[in-house]
């Protein structure tokens, strides 16, 4: 392993759409991939009138946008669906929203998902 890099071997898995998609609803997903590729965890969620609804969590494969991120943080301003990714086992258990705004100071909106 490269010094300082968090190797991702497994991630929290969740699929709100599990019945339609015909998958598990929740569990721990082992992350596989080519030896030369990095592995990450991800989370996607929606904010419905202040209520957090998790859409999906699981493994995410070699994405430069996820490199060296130990925390799962969405930085886009008010997306329709929030997305974050990170490196490290089960790093997607918690996820946060820190919008990058040009003028105003970012506000912290940490999210700790309720167990399904």
């Amino acid at each position: 392993a490269i010094l300082g890099r968090s190797e991702t071997q497994e991630c929290l898995f969740f699929n709100a759409n599990w019945e339609r998609d015909r998958t598990n609803q929740t569990g721990v997903e082992p992350c596989y991939g080519d030896k030369d590729k990095r592995r990450h965890c991800f989370a996607t969620w929606k904010n419905i009138s202040g209520s957090i609804e998790i859409v999906k969590q699981g493994c995410w494969l070699d994405d430069i946008n996820c490199y060296d991120r130990t925390d799962c943080i969405e930085k886009k301003d008010s997306p329709e669906v929030y997305f974050c990714c990170c490196e490290g086992n089960m790093c997607n258990e918690k996820f946060s929203y820190f919008p990058e705004m040009e003028v105003t100071q970012p506000t912290s909106n940490p999210v700790t998902p309720k167990p399904p």
Partner: antibody, heavy 120, light 107 residues
Framework: EVQLLESGGGLVQPGGSLRLSCAAS????????MHWVRQAPGKGLEWVSS????????SYADSVKGRFTISRDNSKNTLYLQMNSLRAEDTAVYYC?????????????WGQGTLVTVSS | DIQMTQSPSSLSASVGDRVTITCRAS??????LNWYQQKPGKAPKLVIY???SRASGVPSRFSGSGSGTDFTLTISSLQPEDFATYYC?????????FGGGTKVEIK
């Protein structure tokens, strides 16, 4: 090297049956979900069916639901597609493909395809 | 079902040209967007996954961008081996759906 090799295609009459196979090698077959995708002559790609790593979950396109059955034998590293009540519109090249994660984030390896022709 | 709309359906270009293909989803698919290249008589080959990540062995002239509903595949300098049909595909939910394809032809 990852390899997927389909077989079992051929000419069949409307209402008939065929069983396609996809032999996998070069990776740990029982760790990956698998898919069937088809392509009618001169047309685009259409997803047909998927199965998770251990066969516990399966999913089908509405166009084949109730007629096609996807299955796998992890001891033989083989994926199957049982096709019954075949129609002319099922005529296509059928590809098997490997899913990269449990969420099928992408299909990273594909077989070369096998042609199914439904005609009287 | 999520509908994927690709444009253009075909284009003519010369070696060395910069080529851009767009794909629009009928609803937000975050970054669950993949691009495949297919040559006549051959199986599709993964080019870009997760909207922006190049698959193994894919040259750096291929790049992907976008998120939400609008996505782009760009070939910065078209090479002879790039003439093919390109498909986008969403994997946000089942059924997985593909765009209609863009055929890149020699001018």
């Amino acid at each position: 090297e990852v390899q997927l090799l389909e077989s079992g295609g051929g000419l069949v009459q409307p209402g008939g049956s065929l069983r396609l196979s996809c032999a996998a090698s070069g990776f740990t077959f029982d760790s990956y979900g698998m898919h069937w995708v088809r392509q009618a002559p001169g047309k685009g790609l259409e997803w047909v069916s998927s199965i998770n790593y251990n066969g516990g979950y399966t999913s089908y396109a509405d166009s084949v639901k109730g007629r096609f059955t996807i299955s796998r034998d992890n001891s033989k590293n083989t994926l199957y597609l049982q096709m019954n009540s075949l129609r002319a519109e099922d005529t296509a090249v059928y590809y098997c493909a490997r899913a990269a994660t449990w969420h099928d984030t992408h299909l990273d390896y594909w077989g070369q395809g096998t042609l199914v022709t439904v005609s009287s | 079902d999520i509908q994927m709309t690709q444009s253009p359906s075909s284009l003519s270009a010369s070696v060395g040209d910069r080529v851009t293909i767009t794909c629009r989803a009928s609803q937000s698919i975050v970054s669950y967007l993949n691009w495949y290249q297919q040559k006549p008589g051959k199986a599709p080959k993964l080019v870009i996954y997760a909207a922006t990540s190049r698959a193994s062995g894919v040259p750096s002239r291929f790049s992907g961008s976008g998120s939400g509903t609008d996505f782009t595949l760009t070939i910065s300098s078209l090479q002879p081996e790039d003439f093919a049909t390109y498909y986008c595909q969403q994997s946000y939910e089942n059924p997985l759906t593909f765009g209609g394809g863009t055929k890149v032809e020699i001018k």
